[in-house]
Interface confidence: medium
């Protein structure tokens, strides 16, 4: 969570002098309650907007908008505290609108906006607007909160943002997986325009079960520039275990911009149609447990083998 540093946020408008300040999320009115406090915000809306930085980067931002209730409490409204809480990390960031003049009328409905909180793909936030001063203990709450979920990098609009592009969102491998026979799987995908290696992670499952019955990792060396955007094919050798027929193929790139945290792409091959009276499938245990400190997958020629080519 962070704030855009450009352009400087503005909260002043016709009839109101105001400045935006960084906040510790602990307004003074918590510690020194006031007798009279304003009512809560009305019609809080959070929308996803996009902002360009001076460097030309494009970031998703939370656009926060709310209005004031048309009551006399605006005479006691000294500002607002905007808080954004990232739910999976409990990280919180706040800013404060500090009113430098008093609101005296409701000739038109007062409306406020703020679009400087930079948000992350595929994250959920709680956005709160507190009117200041905050209420006395046991007083009626004068804040409004809403949750806001940011789309992931698969979304067409998010795909072109800097954080998504940095994690490889523009690469579309267009994976195709074909079962050649009971022991061979052919994987085709499009290489990206970078000399970086890839890993193919194969996990096989019994029909209708989620415990893996075979796992295999295959390393693909970095392509040469003339191979960029070309199709690469890999033939993976499977363990010929009866019923171990549903295969998930995941391709993990190691682009320089995201290293081990690049977006992975998957494709799945279902088991062939089962006969009306299928034979019982035995329970399968994973063929190995990951070594501590190592990847969830490890290459092991005893478990399967593969070969690959790049197509021009």
């Amino acid at each position: 969570l962070r704030l855009l540093d450009f352009p400087a946020p503005v909260c002043a408008q016709e009839g109101l002098s105001c400045r935006v300040k960084n906040s510790t999320c602990l307004d003074d009115s918590w510690i020194h309650p006031r007798n009279l406090t304003p009512s809560s915000p009305k019609d809080l809306q959070i929308q996803l907007h996009f902002a360009h930085t001076q460097q030309g980067d494009l970031f998703p931002v939370a656009h926060i908008e709310w209005t004031l209730q048309t009551d006399a409490s605006i005479l006691y409204l000294e500002g607002a505290e905007l808080s954004v809480l990232q739910l999976n990390t409990n990280e919180r960031l706040c800013v404060r609108f500090e009113f430098l003049s008093k609101l005296r009328h409701h000739h038109r409905r007062w409306r406020f906006t703020f679009s400087h909180f930079v948000v992350d793909p595929d994250q959920e936030y709680e956005v709160t607007v507190h009117h200041l001063p905050k209420p006395i203990p046991d007083g009626d709450p004068n804040h409004q909160s809403k949750n806001f979920l940011v789309p992931d990098c698969e979304h067409a609009r998010m795909k072109v943002t800097t954080p998504c592009m940095s994690s490889g969102s523009l690469w579309d491998p267009n994976i195709t997986v074909e079962t050649l026979d009971t022991q061979h799987l052919r994987v085709d995908f499009t290489l990206w325009n970078e000399s970086t290696h890839y890993q193919i992670l194969l996990t096989s499952f019994p029909h209708m079960e989620n415990h893996s019955c075979f796992e295999h990792m295959h390393h693909i060396p970095a392509p040469r520039p003339e191979e960029f955007h070309q199709r690469s094919n890999v033939t993976l050798t499977l363990r010929n275990l009866k019923g171990c027929c549903r295969h998930q193929v995941q391709i993990q790139p190691f682009f320089s911009s995201c290293l081990n945290d690049c977006l992975r792409h998957s494709a799945t091959v279902s088991c062939p149609e089962m006969p009306d009276t299928p034979e019982p499938i035995p329970d399968y245990m994973p063929l190995w447990e990951p070594r501590s400190g190592s990847s969830d997958y490890k290459d092991d020629d005893d478990k399967g083998s593969s070969h690959h080519h790049h197509h021009h």
Partner: antibody, heavy 131, light 107 residues
Framework: QVQLQESGPGLVKPSETLSLTCTVS????????WNWIRQSPGKGLEWIGD???????NYNPSLKSRVTISVDTSKNQFSLKLSSVTTADTAVYYC?????????????????????????WGQGTTVTVSS | DILMTQSPSSLSASVGDRVTITCRAS??????LGWYQQKPGKAPKRLIY???SLQSGVPSRFSGSGSGTEFTLTISSLQPEDFATYYC?????????FGPGTKVDIK
């Protein structure tokens, strides 16, 4: 109430460049994506591309080599240029706004819709490519 | 590109009929789909957004459902002004693509 109005020549010669402008009135061009779509006679709708108010563009790969979309925020306008036109480019050209993204709250719980999609359209302008 | 298919391509119906149009996507698009109505010589008008949400000002006889790859537009009781061509649009993945359209005419 936001309104869009396409303008530009109705007749373009083959191999020349088609140029259209869309003027946005009744609202700001900021914080939206702005699209161009076309519809050939008796055919369906084809998305040409879009531009964010900041200038960031996306194009349909089938037309990418010939298309340029630009924006002029000071005039509340965005424009389409399609080069090397042929008779196959004869169509009604529409400009459209990509709807803002919002949260919609259901009873007792919230739901999220990242709804982009063309919510406001111009009335369209016919462009004929002919010598 | 995501291919959108619609069925039927045309249908004849009477006022008061219940009409259902289906749109299929060649790959999953979550609920990133809209339904549009177009009358001759006019621009398309959005009826449904996010697969199932009714556009403001659109009569409640129009409804949408579906998610992933299969979507449906239903007109519960067809009115004279509903005779038009209906298109679906996916905006999940660039390039955005429209269905080929379903023409609804008078029986």
């Amino acid at each position: 109430q936001v309104q869009l109005q396409e303008s530009g020549p109705g007749l373009v010669k083959p191999s020349e460049t088609l140029s259209l402008t869309c003027t946005v009135s009744g609202g700001s061009i900021s914080n939206y994506y702005w699209n161009w779509i076309r519809q050939s006679p008796g055919k369906g709708l084809e998305w040409i591309g879009d531009i964010y108010y900041s200038g960031s563009t996306n194009y349909n790969p089938s037309l990418k080599s010939r298309v340029t979309i630009s924006v002029d925020t000071s005039k509340n306008q965005f424009s389409l240029k399609l080069s090397s036109v042929t008779t196959a480019d004869t169509a009604v050209y529409y400009c459209a706004r990509d709807g803002e993204l919002a949260n919609y709250y259901g009873s007792g719980s919230y739901q999220f819709y990242y709804y982009y999609g063309m919510d406001v359209w111009g009335q369209g302008t016919t462009v004929t490519v002919s010598s | 590109d995501i291919l959108m298919t619609q069925s039927p391509s045309s249908l004849s119906a009477s006022v008061g009929d219940r009409v259902t149009i289906t749109c299929r996507a060649s790959q999953g698009i979550r609920n990133d789909l809209g339904w549009y109505q177009q009358k001759p010589g006019k621009a398309p008008k959005r009826l449904i957004y996010a697969a199932s949400s009714l556009q403001s000002g659109v009569p409640s006889r129009f409804s949408g459902s579906g998610s992933g790859t299969e979507f449906t537009l239903t007109i519960s009781s067809l009115q004279p002004e509903d005779f038009a061509t209906y298109y679906c649009l996916q905006h999940n993945s660039n390039p955005f693509t429209f269905g080929p359209g379903t023409k609804v005419d008078i029986k």
